[in-house]
């Protein structure tokens, strides 16, 4: 079998909401995969699951099934959501987020994101993580890649 | 409905001291930043001090940095404005107002209070 | 600082008739993010400031539509479709671009 590539494109788009009683915030993070197949046969992505981590919190996890099937030499970029919080027990990140005097909200977030597919009864799983900025402070469409924090991607000098 | 009444308002000698209260109602005060707002006989309005919900953030202009301090707290809904080395020039109304972050603006306003400053 | 000029004065109005405010920032208070950070308050007499417009074309929460607000980076209006006498009072704008956070000197509206 040749391979199975998954590749992590970006933050599509963050919607964000706020409780002002609970002091959270409610960020609905919506990914983009492209997920090639190399084989001459169809393959089933059976499941993506995908966890979203701010300094090392877990702050959200999204599992979805029986997504697509992927047809020979074929490549479908699936969109995902990650409906994330963070909450009272990161204070002051609320505080950052609803901030009136800073106009662009970035945080750093660990995306992390496995897709499961299977051919011929054999499953295989494919694992990407990738640091992403996201705006905490309002509603962001982003463009492809546009999101991507480089700094940590980088190797260390 | 939202409510934001200031008090401690009064006439004070140059260089003298005095503090500023604003109690809210009406909505969660712990959830969001305040600003102080002044007013002066002129009838011009100038930002004098913001402070974040929870305490992280604060904020003031040049023009009173080191002579008013913001403070709030949320168990008593109470924004406070310490005010010291008072100047003539600091004769004004102060209206504390509240911060709607999806606005991105204060929306309501107390009615504010008045110090004059003269000797 | 970013300065905010306004005149002081409308031209007078008759009730009924439409009014512009105009308001004029030193430096562009249109963000990369595509907001333009510019405000509208009203002072009624005897009263405290309300808001009227958030970021420059978005009316607050129970202000009549018969106003609107619109703008480039630098230069505003503020318009009044058809003017009532509860309009009254001093027009405010504003901008939190930047700290510290500026505001106009106001312009009275004049009713004829």
């Known amino acids: 079998p040749r391979s199975i590539e998954v590749k992590y494109i970006g933050v599509k788009s963050a919607y964000v909401s706020y409780d002002a009683e609970k002091r959270t915030i409610y960020l609905n993070i919506t990914n983009t995969l492209n997920i090639t197949n190399n084989n001459y046969y169809s393959v089933e992505v059976e499941n993506i699951t995908a966890q979203v981590q701010f300094s090392k919190t877990v702050i959200g996890k999204a599992r979805l099934n029986n997504i697509t099937n992927i047809g020979p030499l074929d490549m479908k970029q699936i969109d995902y959501t990650v409906p994330t919080v963070i909450a009272e027990e990161m204070s002051y990140m609320y505080d950052f987020c609803t901030l009136l005097s800073i106009k662009v909200h970035n945080i750093v977030l660990m995306m992390q994101v496995t897709v499961t597919t299977a051919y011929f009864g054999h499953s295989e799983q494919i694992s990407q993580e990738r640091y992403q900025y996201v705006d905490c402070g309002r509603n962001t469409t982003y463009q492809l890649a546009q999101s991507e924090y480089l700094n940590v991607l980088q190797p260390q000098q | 409905e939202v409510q934001l009444v200031e008090s401690g308002g009064d006439l004070v000698k140059p260089g003298g001291s005095l503090k500023l209260s604003c109690v809210a109602s009406?909505?969660?005060?712990?959830?969001?930043?305040m600003s102080w707002v002044r007013q002066t006989p002129d009838k011009r309005l100038e930002w004098v001090a913001t402070?974040?919900?929870?305490?992280?953030?604060?904020y003031y202009p040049d023009s009173v940095k080191g002579r008013l301090t913001v403070s709030r707290d949320n168990a008593k809904n109470t924004l406070y404005l310490q005010m010291s080395s008072l100047k003539s020039e600091d004769t004004a109304i102060y209206y504390c107002?509240?911060?709607?972050?999806?606005?991105?603006?204060?929306?309501?306003w107390g009615q504010g209070t008045t110090l004059t400053v003269s000797s | 600082d970013i300065v905010m000029t306004q005149a002081a004065f409308s031209n007078p109005v008759t009730l009924g008739t439409s009014a512009s405010i105009s308001c004029r920032s030193s430096?562009?208070?249109?963000?990369?993010?595509?907001?333009?950070?510019l405000y509208w308050y009203l002072q009624k007499p005897g009263q405290s400031p309300q808001l009227l417009i958030y970021?420059?074309?978005n009316l607050a929460s129970g202000v009549p539509n018969r106003f609107s607000s619109s703008g480039s980076g630098t230069d505003f209006t503020l318009r009044i479709s058809r003017v009532e006498a509860e309009d009254v009072g001093v027009y405010y704008c504003?901008?939190?671009?930047?700290?510290?956070?500026?505001f106009g000197g106001g312009t009275k509206l004049e009713i004829k």
């Open positions: 504003a901008q939190n671009l930047e700290l510290p956070w500026t």
């Open positions: 107002a509240r911060q709607n972050f999806y606005y991105g603006c204060e929306d309501y």
């Open positions: 430096k562009s208070l249109l963000h990369s993010n595509g907001i333009t950070y």
């Open positions: 402070i974040s919900s929870g305490s992280f953030y604060i």
């Open positions: 009406g909505f969660t005060f712990s959830g969001y930043g």
């Open positions: 970021q420059m074309s």
